[in-house]
Amino acid sequence: YDFTNCDFEKIKAAYLSTISKDLITYMSGTKSTEFNNTVSCSNRPHCLTEIQSLTFNPTAGCASLAKEMFAMKTKAALAIWCPGYSETQINATQAMKKRRKRKVTTNKCLEQVSQLQGLWRRFNRPLLKQQ
C-alpha cells in the first residue's frame, strides 16, 4: 500500500490521543533503555509503511501483535485516513485469521513494540534530520 495520500495530521492526532497510550500500557514494566532502536524511517509515508509492517506482519518470535489494542486502533486510523487502505487489507486480514496463534507477550514482542514507539515518534517529527 502507498501511504502518500494519507491525512498525516489526523493520524498524528490519533497517535497522540490514544495509540501512544496503548503502546505505553503494552510496554509497562520495561525500561525505556532496555531495547535499542534498529528500525528507522525517512518520511511520513515511509514511517507508516514500517509501522504497518511491524504491527501486522508476524515475525520470528512475535506473532501476536495484530490483536493488541494499539494495533486495532492503528488499523482503524489507517483505514479512516488513508484512502483505499482498508480494502487493500481485506485479503491480508483473512489470511491472518487463519494463522492466528495463542496470545503470548514475549521479549521479542516487547522489543518489536519498542521499535514501533520509535517509528511513531519519528512519524510525529518529520522535519528532523536523520541521525
Epitope: 495520500n5 490514544t18 486495532m72 486502533k73 488499523k75 482503524a76 483505514a79 479512516i80 485516513w81 488513508c82 484512502p83 483505499g84 487502505y85 482498508s86 480494502e87 481485506i90
Partner: antibody, heavy 121, light 112 residues
Framework: EVQLVESGGGLVQPGGSLRLSCAAS????????MTWVRQAPGKGLEWVSS????????YYADSVKGRFTISRDNAKNSLSLQMNSLRAEDTAVYYC??????????????WGQGVLVTVSS | DIVMTQTPLSLSVTPGEPASISCRSS???????????LHWYLQKPGQSPQLLIY???YRASGVPDRFSGSGSDTDFTLKISRVEAEDVGVYYC?????????FGGGTKVEIK
Amino acid sequence: EVQLVESGGGLVQPGGSLRLSCAASGFTFSNYGMTWVRQAPGKGLEWVSSITFASSYIYYADSVKGRFTISRDNAKNSLSLQMNSLRAEDTAVYYCTRGGGAYYGGSLDVWGQGVLVTVSS
Amino acid sequence: DIVMTQTPLSLSVTPGEPASISCRSSQSLLHSYGYTYLHWYLQKPGQSPQLLIYLVSYRASGVPDRFSGSGSDTDFTLKISRVEAEDVGVYYCEQTLQTPYTFGGGTKVEIK
C-alpha cells in the same frame, strides 16, 4: 477538481427499468468506496447502496434489494446503478457520493449534483 | 436497523447567535476500535448535501470553524457558534456503524 456527475435519470413507468451512471474525476476513483443516496420530493435522505473499492463488498437497503444492482468500472472511473421493477416510491433525486468504505469513517465527503428519477404511469 | 432521531425539526436563528441541533441513535455508534461513526451534513436550498463533520467531531475540509460536533455513544450535538446567512438549509446526521446506513429526519435552519 474532485467531481461526480450523474446521468441516466428520467420518467419511467412502474415495473420499468433505468440505469444511472456516475462519472468520477479529480481523484483516484479505484481507492474509494462509493455510495448511492436518494431523496424523495420534499423528504429526507435515504441510503440506497454502497460498493467497496474493488467491488469486494456490496450492500443494499432492504427497500431496493433484489431490484437494484450497483456496479463500478475502475478503468473508466464510473459507477452505475441498474434499477429494475421500479415502483412509484422509487421516485427521487439520486445522488452519487464518494464514501461508504472505511475512509473518513464511511462518511460521504463528495456528492454529485443529483439526477431525478420519476416513476409514474 | 439503527434509528436516528433529530431535534428540533426546525430552528429559527438570529444572525450572529448560536444554534444547536441534537441527534440521538437507537444504539451506541461506538466501534470497538474507539471511533464513533456519526456524521453531519448540510443541504443548502436547491443544492446537494455537503459533509460538515465526520466521526462526531472532525471538521471536513473547508468547513468553517464556527461548526463543531460533540457527543458520544448515542447522543450527539452539532453547534454553530455564530449563525451566518449562508448556514440556512437542512442539517442531517448519519450513522455508518452498520448497514443499512441511516440518516436522521433533518433539521431545517432558517434566519429570523
